[in-house]
Structure formats: structure tokens, C-alpha cells
Interface confidence: medium
């Protein structure tokens, strides 16, 4: 439905508060280096303009597209060339090329200082002094560090952030109240950002069809009682929402997400019995709740899939007449019966089925050719099952930190060219699969583990894409979205890798390590471990374990010493020498 003024339409739909917040997020995700004050000024100018269009939709420039209005505004930033270099060239382009250009310059790993949390009293004072600015600053800082963060969901995080400060800044023990809430928001926020990054990568690198297939599988697992046509409707609408958000169209995205939540709640009887509680909540909570809702119970007595998809004489006819709808039905039927499978496994099965039909429907005897197609699924199902079983056993034996270390060694040997910070970050996250998923019963382990690993490996892919250094990573990341994890799992030690020169500086530590949090200290040790493997890729587990145990003992000893710095200097030299000897460096 066309509106005379798109900006007026969105302002009225979303309301001033959400409009301003979403424009701020959009601008911060595009111009990630711009100071907060500059963004606030731009947002205020856009908001004032939007208000004139609400008053008179025929006013000058009100008929312009949002991309044109926002792009024109971003291109007024005086320091664009100095701060962003070639991104400034985007401003010479016309829409829609200009917006595409801005999107291509989004940086998944911007060179921004780590966010340091001030003292609780300092934060509470800032919150009370100017609540609006305090919350805007939160949106800005998260958005610029996570340029693909799902904007309507960030509004939900900001609402919870505000609630935490409102409650805790008047509590007797402010820190005890606030800090766990902020930790939870930080961890959930990182997870949310990574999940959305995979959705955007799926759409942008593999296309709408890939995203829709993912959505059919996931929604069919979640809503197994819904008809195929209903699932298809939800998939179409959800694809539009995510296409918009990933494309920087945050106002449209938030508006359409609200419409989708409204539709789902109005039609919950034909979608899922689990939606009742979600649908009683306010908008932001409602949308979040629907996105996280548990799987509904499977309908009783679902018939065998073989009848329609293997035994029927009409398989090739149905496939030929509407390939994507027939394959969609197959995926829907398989997924609603298998909440115990990961989405990526379901997509592999659908791909195998499609490949078989492509081949067999052109054969002399199609039915004879595809009669055993379901047998081809067995090894595909067993591979992730076995992998998860083995890794959960390893996790239970080692605990999270040592399990992460095992993965660090494994992945550094597979792709030693990747930067050390990326290997540490990705392997630590891969290692978290243990505590996240291994506690679940068998029926929930695979969807938890393999779909989580897809999200983490996508982090590796987007970070590697910025500065590609490994053909093996590029190959696993680009060949097939659903086979990324099996591709990485199948990589062996890279025999072509020339070991890194030994640099004593890499293994020189100072007393500042003693004041670090446990997490930061782990990262320091894991960074050293990666560097060790890069120097000695053929080192055995036993050799590496011995060196790491010595290293842990060295840190513990020096942190207890009276003269810590001297201890680190003298004992550090001995440790480096002993490690070189142990590893034959």
C-alpha cells in the first residue's frame, strides 16, 4: 500500500520514541566511528523533518524514499573522507547503489575500544541525571559494535537495560542487584547479535531461497500443528522482516515485525498452543517471546512420509509441477516430525532428496531410482549424532576451559593462518556448546548443538571475509551454508603451513595479568596456546598440556610473589627456555 510520504507513514506507525531509537541504530550501524553527539544531532534533524511530513505529507522532500533521506543525511557528515576513507565514495552514487555501498562497508570487527563498565554509582548517577541520553548511548554503543544487530530486538534489550537501572539504582546493594542483570544482558546480546548475523549472511551470501528453507524447517519444528500453507505464510512474512533489517531498512523491519506478531497472535489457534502467554505481553516482549517460544507438541498419528514422497506414483509429477512448493512440503513434513534434528541436518536431508529427484525423474524408471532415497539419510543423521556424543563426553571429562583449549588446538591446526584473536574468540565460543547443550537430553542435543555451531562458525566466516588468509576457510564458508560445520569438522592438520617464527615477546608476561578477571586471564593463556601451536603445529597433546600446566603454575607463583614484575621477568625467561626445549623449538 503506497503512502504519499514513507517517512510520515513510519513515524505514525512506530511513534516518536521508537522512530528516533531506530534511526539512531541505523545511523550508528552505518557510520560506526562517528561520535555519539554527531549521531544524536542527525537523528534530531531527521525527526524534526519527519514531523513536518506528518503535518503535511505534500511538504517538500516528504515523498522521498527513506534510503534517499537517510543517505542524504549521512552524506552531510563533514569528516566522512578522513574517518571512513573510501566509504565516502558511496555518497557520489545514486540510490539504490548508495545504500548497497554503505551496506558493503559495514564492519563486523570495527576498531573501537572495548566497552569498560564504570562503577555502579557512576552509572546510576548518569542514569538519573539524564535517562534519555543514557539509554541512547546504550543503543549507539551496541549498534556501532554490532552493525547487523536485529534492530527491533535491540529496542527490547534497551527496555530491559532501562528496567535494570530503574530497579537497581534504588536498591540497598546496587551492585548486587545490577551487575548480574548487566552480565545477563551482555551475554544474551552477544548471542542475539551472532544469531542475527547468520540470518543476514544467509540472505546476503546464499539468497532468499536459502533463508526461506531455513525458516520452513525451523517454523515447522516449532509449529508442527500448523498447516503447510500457514507455515508458508509465516515464512514469507518473516523473510520480508529479516531482508529489511539486514538491508538497513530498520523502520520498515520493525513495523513489519510488529504486524507479524499481531498476525500470529490473532491466528494462534491455527499456529500453536504455546503462544498464549507470549500474546498477552506488550509489543517488544511479545515479539521476543514468539521468537523464542518452545516447540508445540507434534500432532498424534502423523502418517509415514514414504507414502507421499517415495511410494506415490505422482512424486515426479508433483515435483515437476512446482519444485519449490513440493520440496517445501517435504521439508515441512520432515521437520514437524523431527524436533530432535538440527535445522541444518533437515536442510541437508531436503537437499539430498532434491538431488535424488533431479537425477531420478529423468531416469527410465524413476520410482526404482528413488525408492531407496530415505536410506541415504541414515549416514547424514548419524554423523552429527556421533560427533555430538564424542564431544559431549570430552566436555564432561575436561570441563569448559580445557574443552575450549582442546578446540583451540584442533582449529589452530586446521586453519593456522587465521589471526590469533579470531581463533581464540571462535574456539572459546565453540567450546561453550558443551555447557549450553550437553546438559540436554538426547532429543534436544542436536538442535541445540549443531544450530549453535552454525552461528559460531558464521562468526569465523564473516571475520575471515574481512581479511581472507586461508583458502580452506573460504572454501568451507562459501561452498554450502548447511555443510559449513561438516566441512570444518572434516579438515585435518594443514600440512602446507610453514610454522611461525618463534618470538619470545609473544610469551612475555607482566604483573598486570594478576589483576585481570578469571575470563581475561583465560584469554591470555589461550592466546599463548594458539601461538604455541602456530610455532609447533606438530606438537602432541601431551607436549602442549605440559607447557600449559607449567605456564599456569608460573602465573600462579608470580602473582603470589612480593616482587611480581621481577618474578615475571626472571621466571618467564626460564619458562620460555623450558618450553622451547619441551617442544623442540
Amino acid at each position: 500500500d503506497a503512502h504519499k510520504s514513507e517517512v510520515a507513514h513510519r513515524f505514525k506507525d512506530l511513534g516518536e520514541e521508537n522512530f528516533k531509537a531506530l534511526v539512531l541504530i541505523a545511523f550508528a550501524q552505518y557510520l560506526q566511528q562517528c561520535p555519539f553527539e554527531d549521531h544524536v544531532k542527525l537523528v534530531n534533524e531527521v525527526t524534526e523533518f519527519a514531523k513536518t511530513c506528518v503535518a503535511d505529507e505534500s511538504a517538500e522532500n516528504c515523498d522521498k524514499s527513506l534510503h534517499t533521506l537517510f543517505g542524504d543525511k549521512l552524506c552531510t557528515v563533514a569528516t566522512l573522507r578522513e574517518t571512513y576513507g573510501e566509504m565516502a565514495d558511496c555518497c557520489a552514487k545514486q540510490e539504490p547503489e548508495r545504500n548497497e555501498c554503505f551496506l558493503q562497508h559495514k564492519d563486523d570487527n570495527p576498531n573501537l575500544p572495548r566497552l569498560v563498565r564504570p562503577e555502579v554509582d557512576v552509572m546510576c548517577t548518569a542514569f538519573h541525571d539524564n535517562e534519555e541520553t543514557f539509554l541512547k548511548k546504550y543503543l549507539y554503543e551496541i549498534a556501532r559494535r554490532h552493525p547487523y544487530f536485529y534492530a527491533p530486538e535491540l529496542l527490547f534489550f534497551a527496555k530491559r537495560y532501562k528496567a535494570a537501572f530503574t530497579e537497581c539504582c534504588q536498591a540497598a546493594d546496587k551492585a548486587a542487584c545490577l551487575l548480574p542483570k548487566l552480565d545477563e544482558l551482555r551475554d544474551e546480546g552477544k548471542a542475539s547479535s551472532a544469531k542475527q548475523r547468520l540470518k543476514c549472511a544467509s540472505l546476503q551470501k546464499f539468497g532468499e531461497r536459502a533463508f526461506k528453507a531455513w525458516a520452513v524447517a525451523r517454523l515447522s519444528q516449532r509449529f508442527p500443528k500448523a498447516e503447510f500453507a500457514e507455515v508458508s505464510k509465516l515464512v514469507t512474512d518473516l523473510t520480508k522482516v529479516h531482508t529489511e533489517c539486514c538491508h538497513g531498512d530498520l523502520l520498515e523491519c520493525a513495523d513489519d515485525r510488529a504486524d507479524l506478531a499481531k498476525y500470529i497472535c490473532e491466528n494462534q489457534d491455527s499456529i500453536s498452543s504455546k503462544l498464549k502467554e507470549c500474546c498477552e505481553k506488550p509489543l517488544l516482549e511479545k515479539s521476543h517471546c514468539i521468537a523464542e517460544v518452545e516447540n508445540d507438541e507434534m500432532p498424534a498419528d502423523l502418517p509415514s512420509l514414504a507414502a507421499d514422497f517415495v511410494e506415490s506414483k505422482d512424486v515426479c509429477k508433483n515435483y515437476a509441477e512446482a519444485k519449490d512448493v513440493f520440496l517445501g512440503m517435504f521439508l515441512y513434513e520432515y521437520a514437524r516430525r523431527h524436533p530432535d534434528y538440527s535445522v541444518v541436518l533437515l536442510l541437508r536431508l531436503a537437499k539430498t532428496y532434491e538431488t535424488t529427484l533431479e537425477k531420478c525423474c529423468a531416469a527410465a524408471d524413476p520410482h526404482e531410482c528413488y525408492a531407496k532415497v530415505f536410506d541415504e539419510f541414515k549416514p547424514l543423521v548419524e554423523e552429527p549424532q556421533n560427533l555430538i556424543k564424542q564431544n559431549c563426553e570430552l566436555f564432561e571429562q575436561l570441563g569448559e576451559y580445557k574443552f575450549q583449549n582442546a578446540l583451540l588446538v584442533r582449529y589452530t591446526k586446521k586453519v593456522p593462518q587465521v589471526s590469533t584473536p579470531t581463533l581464540v574468540e571462535v574456539s572459546r565460543n565453540l567450546g561453550k556448546v558443551g555447557s549450553k547443550c550437553c546438559k540436554h537430553p538426547e532429543a534436544k542435543r542436536m538442535p541445540c548443538a549443531e544450530d549453535y555451531l552454525s552461528v559460531v562458525l558464521n562468526q569465523l566466516c564473516v571475520l575471515h571475509e574481512k581479511t581472507p588468509v586461508s583458502d580452506r576457510v573460504t572454501k568451507c564458508c562459501t561452498e554450502s551454508l548447511v555443510n559449513r560445520r561438516p566441512c570444518f569438522s572434516a579438515l585435518e592438520v594443514d600440512e602446507t603451513y610453514v610454522p611461525k617464527e618463534f618470538n619470545a615477546e609473544t610469551f612475555t608476561f607482566h604483573a598486570d595479568i594478576c589483576t585481570l578477571s578469571e575470563k581475561e586471564r583465560q584469554i591470555k593463556k589461550q592466546t599463548a596456546l594458539v601461538e604455541l601451536v602456530k610455532h609447533k603445529p606438530k606438537a602432541t597433546k601431551e607436549q602442549l598440556k605440559a607447557v600449559m600446566d607449567d605456564f599456569a603454575a608460573f602465573v600462579e607463583k608470580c602473582c603470589k610473589a612480593d616482587d611480581k614484575e621481577t618474578c615475571f621477568a626472571e621466571e618467564g625467561k626460564k619458562l620460555v627456555a623450558a618450553s622451547q626445549a619441551a617442544l623442540g623449538l
Epitope: E227, F228, A229, E230, S232, K233, T236, N267, Y332
Partner: nanobody, 119 residues
């Protein structure tokens, strides 16, 4: 009792247009996805197009994409199929049906309306 009554068929020249209608009763039309299927003389059933209960999304068989448009008016309990650029191979008996709950079986059928494309 469920009833589906198709109309609008007839004889038309290649390149011409027709609009088929299907009046529904006996079930809650506005919560049912609907489709058009056709059966050419001596051939099996071929599904043509599906429409969700809300009007979007819609799906089309590759053979009719870009030429046919499915639509519905829930206030009138009526399903439509606008057929443009008709070809000889579109000659068939056209049925409207309630979309299957999940599998490939169609729940309810009409009696059909004949479309003949010939010069």
C-alpha cells in the same frame, strides 16, 4: 455441508483472458487456504495456484507464472483466478479446492468449470 461452485469458464482464443470464480460455503472460508487445480483431457491433475487464507502469499505452477493471478474476497467467500495470455495447453477442467492440511490430498472439491482455448 461443504460446497464449492466454480464458474466463468468458456471458449476463448489464444492470447485471450478469462476470470474464474469459486463460491464457497459450509466451512470457515477465511481461515482456509485455497487452490486451483486443473485436469486437461486425458491427463492427470495439475495444481495451478495456491493462496493463503489472508491473501498473501500466493504460489503458482511454473507453467502459469506471470500469466495467472489468484485472489480471494473473504467477505464474499469467493476465490478467483484471473487468466491472461491463454494458450492451447491451458485447455482443461478447472477445479477449486480447499488446500490440504499438510499432505498431498485435497480436502474438498468443486464440480469444475471448463476452459477451452482454441482459434
Amino acid at each position: 455441508e461443504v460446497q464449492l461452485l466454480e464458474s466463468g469458464g468458456g471458449l476463448v482464443q489464444p492470447g485471450g483472458s478469462l476470470r474464474l470464480s469459486c463460491a464457497a460455503s459450509g466451512f470457515t472460508f477465511d481461515t482456509s487456504s485455497m487452490l486451483w487445480v486443473r485436469q486437461a483431457p486425458g491427463k492427470g491433475l495439475e495444481w495451478v495456484s495456491v493462496i493463503h487464507q489472508s491473501g498473501t502469499p500466493t504460489y503458482y505452477a511454473d507453467s502459469v507464472k506471470g500469466r495467472f493471478t489468484i485472489s480471494r474476497d473473504n467477505s464474499k467467500n469467493t476465490l478467483y483466478l484471473q487468466m491472461n495470455s491463454l494458450r492451447a495447453e491451458d485447455t482443461a477442467l478447472y477445479y477449486c479446492a480447499k488446500f490440504p492440511s499438510s499432505r498431498m490430498k485435497f480436502d474438498y472439491w468443486g464440480q469444475g468449470t471448463l476452459v477451452q482455448v482454441s482459434s
